[in-house]
């Protein structure tokens, strides 16, 4: 049978040939009658055999990391017979390891993100090096990790390559660190090979900074003419944190006057001071408010960094604006009796300059020929007024500052012209009446009514009478209906168209004013030739035809 030990050949041997071992048959008695042969991958090129002795030699340098074992076949032949002495057999040559490979970090580059202010012991990242040497062969591939750069903030676990925080870090002081890790094989013993890697460790932000005002005192100004909602200025705080952790909200901490408000511009992170209530320079021209600023988002565990909000004081100076005159009332209503003489007193309007300088005021009336106003605001008439022409006057009174004629205010003034009884009642229309020749006594000829242009406080009441002459010699009589109407009746039987074709009756109408006024109104009565029915229709028709130029037969 075959006789051999396990074959090993060290890698990286520089000699021309290196004795690996000997193959032999136990039938070989050393008389050189056997011939040994080597077959298989590497036979003749990497390994050769002494055909006589069976000694195997490596004739080239081997690299275990390239090939760690060779499987060869051996034959032994009896030279005399040419026959195989032993059956062909497979054997293995193992390449033994030497420490010829340094550790390598294959997952480079390394980058890790860890929250700032993380406590000691927080895991950052694990780095792993690979060593191509044989892990089963001594310590050639047993690695030890150490920190070349990164103290005192980081540490590395020697056997695992786990990087941990060893000291709290503040992103606001330094936001990234380069850590250099070394991996050594041979567990760091002499002759060990090493490799290094760099790890970029970035600190993510936590909200460990509160916003702080850039200024402890601000000065703003606002015009007294500014409407509510006006932005009067901005205030600014800074926060060393970034992103969401730097978002802030401004608010009023102190404003006794409740005149101002602060809104936050979330794009610029500024506080905008706005006017909540209109200001009046003459009432208050200096304000002081205190504003505070806080982060929008604060985690409970970070509250210790946000105990007292930063505050600032804002002085606000109100700027005076020359304001137009201010009337005592928004409008005035005055009364004056009609027919009062020119220059009569109507009323007084009053405006003042609301500013501190108290400019004198000049008054004027826009487009009026009926009224006048003096520098004291006294309104008088320039003509006598007639209520029956105009009962109300709508005036526009303008007040102008003497020191600044551009400062003008106008208000409406309503003047009511009060009635006096200066008009007597009169017929409400023109009456044309007709009576038949054959009319009997007591026949109703006409119903009349009256109007009075005067205004009556109570209801108008009119009194109807015939004139004295007509009462004494009248063919007609009048009855007052007591309802502002009266009826005219015949006072005799029969009329003669030929003798008296027309009657003119004077009717007196009196009103109930104080003093009472009376007018004389003439009623025209035509005598008609009527048919038997006593209708005046034909008479009226005849009248119409005559008035149009036709003659009736």
């Amino acid at each position: 049978g075959w006789v051999w030990n396990q074959f090993f050949v060290p890698e990286e041997m520089n000699t021309t040939s290196h004795h690996v071992g000997r193959l032999r048959s136990d039938l070989d008695n050393g008389n050189n009658s056997f011939q040994y042969k080597l077959l298989g991958a590497g036979a003749g090129s990497t390994f050769i055999i002494d055909e006589r002795t069976g000694d195997i030699y490596a004739i080239e340098k081997l690299d275990r990391e390239e090939r760690s074992l060779y499987i060869l076949r051996a034959q032994v032949i009896d030279i005399t017979t040419g026959r195989a002495v032993e059956p062909e057999s497979e054997f293995v040559i193992k390449v033994s390891d030497i420490n010829d490979n340094e550790p390598k970090f294959l997952d480079e580059p390394y980058e890790a993100i860890v929250p700032e202010m993380s406590p000691e012991g927080t895991l950052v990242i694990q780095v792993t090096a690979s060593d191509a040497d044989d892990p089963s062969s001594g310590n050639n591939a047993r690695l030890l990790y150490s920190l070349l750069q990164g103290q005192p903030y980081f540490s590395v676990e020697p056997t695992t390559g786990v990087i941990r925080i060893s000291s709290k870090m503040d992103r606001e002081l330094q936001d990234e660190y380069w850590v250099i890790i070394q991996a050594k094989d041979m567990i760091g013993q002499p002759g060990a090979l090493s490799g290094t890697t760099s790890v970029l460790i970035k600190l993510s932000d936590v909200n460990d900074n509160k916003p702080i005002f850039k200024e402890s005192l601000y000065r703003l100004t606002v015009s007294e003419s500014a409407p509510t909602g006006t932005s009067i200025g901005t205030i600014m705080a800074y926060d060393n944190d970034i992103g969401e952790n730097a978002e802030m909200d401004y608010s009023i901490e102190e404003d006794d006057s409740q005149t101002f408000d602060i809104i936050t511009n979330h794009e610029t992170q500024e506080g905008i001071v706005i006017l909540k209530k209109k200001v009046n320079f003459e009432h208050q021209n200096h304000y002081g408010i205190r504003a505070k600023v806080k982060n929008h988002h604060v985690d409970k565990q970070l509250m210790k960094y946000h105990t007292e909000a930063s505050t600032t004081f804002i002085k606000i100076q109100v700027e005076d604006v020359d304001e137009p005159p201010l009337f005592l009332l928004p409008y005035y209503i005055f009364e004056i009796f009609e027919e009062t003489p020119q220059g009569s007193f109507v009323g007084v309007v009053s405006a003042t300059d609301p500013d501190n300088r108290k400019s004198p005021i000049r008054y004027s009336i826009t487009r009026s020929k009926v009224f006048n106003i003096d520098d004291n605001g006294t309104i008088t008439t320039t003509n006598s007024l007639d209520r029956e022409i105009s009962a109300w006057y709508n005036l526009s009174i303008t007040a102008t500052e003497k020191y600044n004629i551009e400062q003008i205010s106008s208000i409406p003034v309503y003047v009511q012209v009060l009635n006096i009884n200066d008009h007597a009642p009169e017929f409400s229309q023109y009456y044309e009446s007709y009576v038949c020749e054959n009319a009997g006594s007591g026949q109703v000829i006409q119903t009349i009514s009256a109007v009075d242009r005067d205004e009556s406080i109570e209801e108008h009441h009119f009194y109807f009478n015939l004139s004295v002459e007509d009462t004494n010699s009248s063919s007609f009589t009048i009855i007052d209906n007591q309802d502002n109407t009266a009826v005219i009746l015949t006072n005799r039987t029969g009329f003669n168209l030929q003798e008296e074709p027309i009657f003119y009756i004077s009717i007196l109408i009196a009103d109930n004013g104080i003093p009472s006024l009376t007018s004389t109104n003439t009623l025209t009565i035509h005598v008609c030739d009527c048919d038997d029915s006593g209708s005046t229709q034909t008479c009226q028709y005849q009248e119409l035809m005559l008035s149009m130029g036709f003659k009736t037969e």
Epitope: E215, S216, L217, Y218, R219, Q284, N285, H286, Y287, K315
Partner: antibody
């Protein structure tokens, strides 16, 4: 600590212009938010505010003195000045310069005052 | 303008006693706009209280201020010998006006 010091003639003739200067030390006159005032005190009487100025040159005066008062500022010299024209004996007083406070318009820092007498 | 009236004109008290000085405004002012000053002869006024109850830097806690609207008070809880002098109130809301002063003298 801010300190203020008034300087100027102690005697002014009637109808002339009274001129005083206040020099600020221990702080900048250009400090944001602070107003620099002149206040006077007639002999044995109360205090009367004359006017103030901001470092930008914006001034505001007591309405009763407005027509005669001018306050100006020189930031390069850290000084501000008062001019009161057409003086009469009624303007005889101790004149103080002052700075307002960090939390309001009260007067936190005062100069020691200078007596100005108006007399011919 | 806002007129400030101080009463009494003179307050005669003994050291160790409590002093109550009054300042009345002619119209309402916000409490944040009133200050008190102390003035010793030949010296400039010194800020005591502002707004109306905050003590200025270095002012002893025996001085306190209170009030709102039109009525304000300066209280000196226990008079020390150096407290016998003149006190002024000042409003700084509508322009700046001072009260006529109250003199605290030794009884």
């Amino acid at each position: 600590q801010v300190q203020l010091q008034e300087s100027g003639p102690g005697l002014v003739k009637p109808s002339q212009t009274l001129s005083l200067t206040c020099t600020v030390s221990g702080g900048s006159i250009s400090s944001s938010g602070y107003y620099w005032s002149w206040i006077r005190q007639h002999p044995g009487k109360g205090l009367e505010w004359i006017g103030y100025i901001y470092y930008t040159g914006s001034a505001y005066y007591n309405p009763s003195l407005k027509s005669r008062v001018t306050i100006s500022v020189d930031t390069s010299k850290n000084q501000f000045s008062l001019k009161l024209s057409s003086v009469t004996a009624a303007d005889t007083a101790v004149y103080y310069c002052a700075r307002d406070g960090s939390s309001g318009w009260y007067f936190q820092y005062w100069g020691q005052g200078t007596l100005v007498t108006v007399s011919s | 303008e806002i007129v400030l009236t101080q009463s009494p004109g003179t307050l005669s008290l003994s050291p160790g006693e409590r002093a109550t000085l009054s300042c009345r405004a002619s119209r309402n002012i916000s409490s944040s706009y009133l200050a008190w000053y102390q003035q010793k002869p030949g010296q400039a006024p010194r800020l005591l209280i502002y707004g109306p109850s905050s003590r200025a830097t270095g002012i002893p806690d025996r001085f306190s201020g209170s009030g709102s609207g039109t009525d304000f008070t300066l209280t000196i809880s226990r008079l020390e010998p150096e407290d016998f002098t003149v006190y002024y109130c000042q409003q700084y809301g509508s322009s700046f006006t001072f009260g006529p002063g109250t003199k605290v003298d030794i009884k």
